[in-house]
Amino acid sequence: NEGSVTGSCYCGKRISSDSPPSVQFMNRLRKHLRAYHRCLYYTRFQLLSWSVCGGNKDPWVQELMSCLDLKECGHAYSGIVAHQKHLLPTSPPISQASEGASSDIHTPAQMLLSTLQSTQRPTLPVGSLSSDKELTRPNETTIHTAGHSLAAGPEAGENQKQPEKNAGPTARTSAT
């Protein structure tokens, strides 16, 4: 159904192979990515309220697909931004909660409950919103828009408690 407005291969924005996305735009895509659909010649990425397409063989397309497959994008993305300089300290453990998020929309009540449920968090840049955690289990939240099924992904149901800490020799490096 390539070309169908309501089908999974409708493109809101097509990115040419000649001009791949900037680092900043890729970070935005990583954060808001909800799903992808393999079409005949291109891949369509569904974000929260819009879509973008790129050629199947474009490196950035394969990178984003891989990122979502490994649950390193979208619901789970920690939101590192380029040129970050300041890092928040990890918060003290309080209780146990699930990792993952079902939406980019966080109400104040959700944010408060998130804070109360948090155990130690990964270190995040100031001003960034971690979408590592939400209130739903996997497959509970499914939003249908224009014929597309957007559900909480694998990361949304991470039963494992929150990250203990950042680890590794390069764990506190700044920009990607």
């Epitope: 697909m65 490994l70 390193e72 990792e99 149901g157 991470e158 990250p163």
Partner: antibody, heavy 118, light 113 residues
């Protein structure tokens, strides 16, 4: 060819420490989600720990049985993952496998044996 | 945690027969973001590390004989070994990687009569 080579296992007394290493090659290490899985002799497989990629702050996750005692880290510049194991218990005795989760599959090393005994 | 229930625990078949191993998860492993099932199958022979046979529930790992196939979606999955050979004697495990912690089935021991 993808390779994961674990090292650092050995015999240690209860309460002691060991640091396991996992040297990777044959794939883009920085894009892989790394995990440790262990297997006691004659038993099934048990997930131990996970570390995410740089864009996600190298966030780490641990099985309840090792939380607070084990620390997972990675050095993307050296294509190596590490598992620091402190306050070891006899029940930590197992073969420890390093795994790399990529879109092309989940790769496993040959394992390194950790024996905790007095 | 997602519970993986594997059956049978063990089975003995004659060479050339077809083996079917079942794996059931306590919740769906199908991710709507990519329509993939986060399930893998492994073969483990004595003294060896687990060998990946199948990932994404049905994708055969490179180098794995085509007599091994995976099927299923959601919560019910099957590993089929058609025309079992002597070298297939091993323990087979299913594993979900949809969620942390990764969890494994209890294993199915396959023997040749």
């Amino acid at each position: 060819e993808v390779q994961l080579v674990e090292s650092g296992g050995g015999l240690v007394q209860p309460g002691g420490s060991l640091k396991l290493s996992c040297a990777a090659s044959g794939f883009t290490f920085s894009n892989a989600v790394m995990n440790w899985v262990r297997q006691a002799s004659g038993k099934g497989l048990e997930w131990v720990a996970r570390i995410r990629t740089k864009p996600n702050n190298y966030a780490t996750f641990y099985a309840d049985s090792v939380k607070g005692r084990f620390t997972f880290s990675r050095d993307d510049s050296k294509n190596t993952a590490y598992l620091q194991m402190n306050s070891l218990k006899t029940e930590d005795t197992a073969m420890y496998y390093c795994t790399a989760w990529t879109t092309e599959g989940i790769y496993w090393g040959q394992g390194t044996l950790v024996t905790v005994s007095s | 945690d997602i519970v993986m229930t594997q059956s049978p625990d063990s089975l003995a078949v004659s060479a050339g027969e077809t083996v079917t191993i079942n794996c059931k998860s306590s919740q769906s492993l199908l991710y709507s973001g990519n329509q993939k099932n986060y399930l893998a199958w492994y073969q483990q022979k004595p003294g060896q590390s687990p060998k990946l046979l199948i990932y994404w529930a049905s994708t055969r790992q490179s180098g794995v004989p085509d007599r091994f196939s995976g099927s299923g979606s959601g919560t019910d999955f099957t590993l089929t070994i058609s025309s079992v050979q002597a070298e297939d004697v091993a323990v087979y495990y299913c594993q979900q990687y949809y969620d942390t912690p990764w969890t494994f089935g209890g294993g199915t021991k396959v023997e040749i009569k």
